[in-house]
């Protein structure tokens, strides 16, 4: 079958990194500069992705594979294949249309990305606040007052960590 296909379509013999040049009797020609073909039998080469501005080059384009970008420091990748770059903020902040803004009282963000999330409400688990929350850190819940009374045999283990919030993508 492969031999038959080759006889019918000479382009199928063109390897990755080349294209089947209709202008030259379907000879396999190398991809021009700044282009690539990642599979054989291509009739054109694809233009290499350019990593510029907010993007920087993580992997150079070759004749057989596209360039890969990441983000210039101060920004982080979003989307498949780093299709976008989003601004970093400091811990204790979240990104808004107006840029990085401090977390409101009662919320925190311990990362350079994502949104400010409410402090854990210790009382919902019958616990007390052991360490106060800040813009950068969640509160630490301690044992309930009852657990600290004389004769209490053991300290209640801390509540399991909540699933952290994620930056919308």
């Amino acid at each position: 079958f492969e031999r038959t296909r080759s006889l019918q379509d000479p382009c199928s013999n063109c390897p990755a990194g080349t294209f089947c040049d209709n202008n030259r009797n379907q000879i396999c020609s190398p991809c021009p500069p700044n282009s690539f073909s990642s599979a054989g039998g291509q009739r054109t080469c694809d233009i290499c992705r350019q990593c510029k501005g907010v993007f920087r080059t993580r992997k150079e384009c070759s004749s057989t594979s596209n360039a890969e970008c990441d983000c210039t420091p101060g920004f982080h990748c979003l989307g498949a294949g780093c299709s976008m770059c989003e601004q970093d903020c400091k811990q204790g902040q979240e990104l808004t249309k107006k840029g990085c803004k401090d977390c409101c009282f009662g919320t925190f963000n311990d990362q350079k990305r994502g949104i400010c999330r409410p402090w854990t409400n210790c009382s919902l688990d019958g616990k007390s606040v052991l360490v106060n929350g800040t813009k950068e850190r969640d509160v630490v819940c301690g044992p309930s007052p009852a657990d600290l009374s004389p004769g209490a045999s053991s300290v209640t283990p801390p509540a399991p960590a909540r699933e952290p919030g994620h930056s919308p993508q």
């Epitope: 501005g53 907010v54 989307g79 976008m84 989003e86 601004q87 990104l95 249309k97 930056s167």
Partner: nanobody, 123 residues
Framework: QVQLVESGGGLVQPGGSLRLSCAAT?????NYWMNWVRQAPGKGLEW???????????YYVDSVEGRFTISRDNAKSSLYLQMSSLRAEDTAVYFC????????????????SGQGTTVTVSS
């Protein structure tokens, strides 16, 4: 091909003014939020300003508020940054950048940017 090309940079004295332009081709400018970002020598990238599709919303980083003005002319597929009362710390390469699909709703990601134009503030 989607492309952004900045121009208008140059050498200016402290206190002076400069107007940067960004020409957009290969897409309809009026469909997108647009941004200016900058990179000072040896520093990371810093967001400067953004503007919504029709120019009714504009936001700035605190350090340029009241000195810089972002604007757009969708009919000319152009974005602008008017910079006045320039300071040495404004020295940077300035890039215009397009807000990706869903910008301001799902994320604040930038998906296309230009090569940049250099602004040097020095006496």
């Amino acid at each position: 091909q989607v492309q952004l090309v900045e121009s208008g940079g140059g050498l200016v004295q402290p206190g002076g003014s400069l107007r940067l332009s960004c020409a957009a081709t290969g897409f309809t400018l009026s469909n997108y939020w647009m941004n200016w970002v900058r990179q000072a020598p040896g520093k990371g990238l810093e967001w400067v300003a953004n503007i919504n599709q029709d120019g009714s919303e504009k936001y700035y980083v605190d350090s340029v508020e009241g000195r810089f003005t972002i604007s757009r002319d969708n009919a000319k597929s152009s974005l602008y940054l008017q910079m006045s009362s320039l300071r040495a710390e404004d020295t940077a390469v300035y890039f215009c950048a397009r807000g990706g699909e869903g910008y301001g709703v799902d994320h604040y990601g930038l998906d296309v940017s230009g090569q940049g134009t250099t602004v040097t503030v020095s006496s």
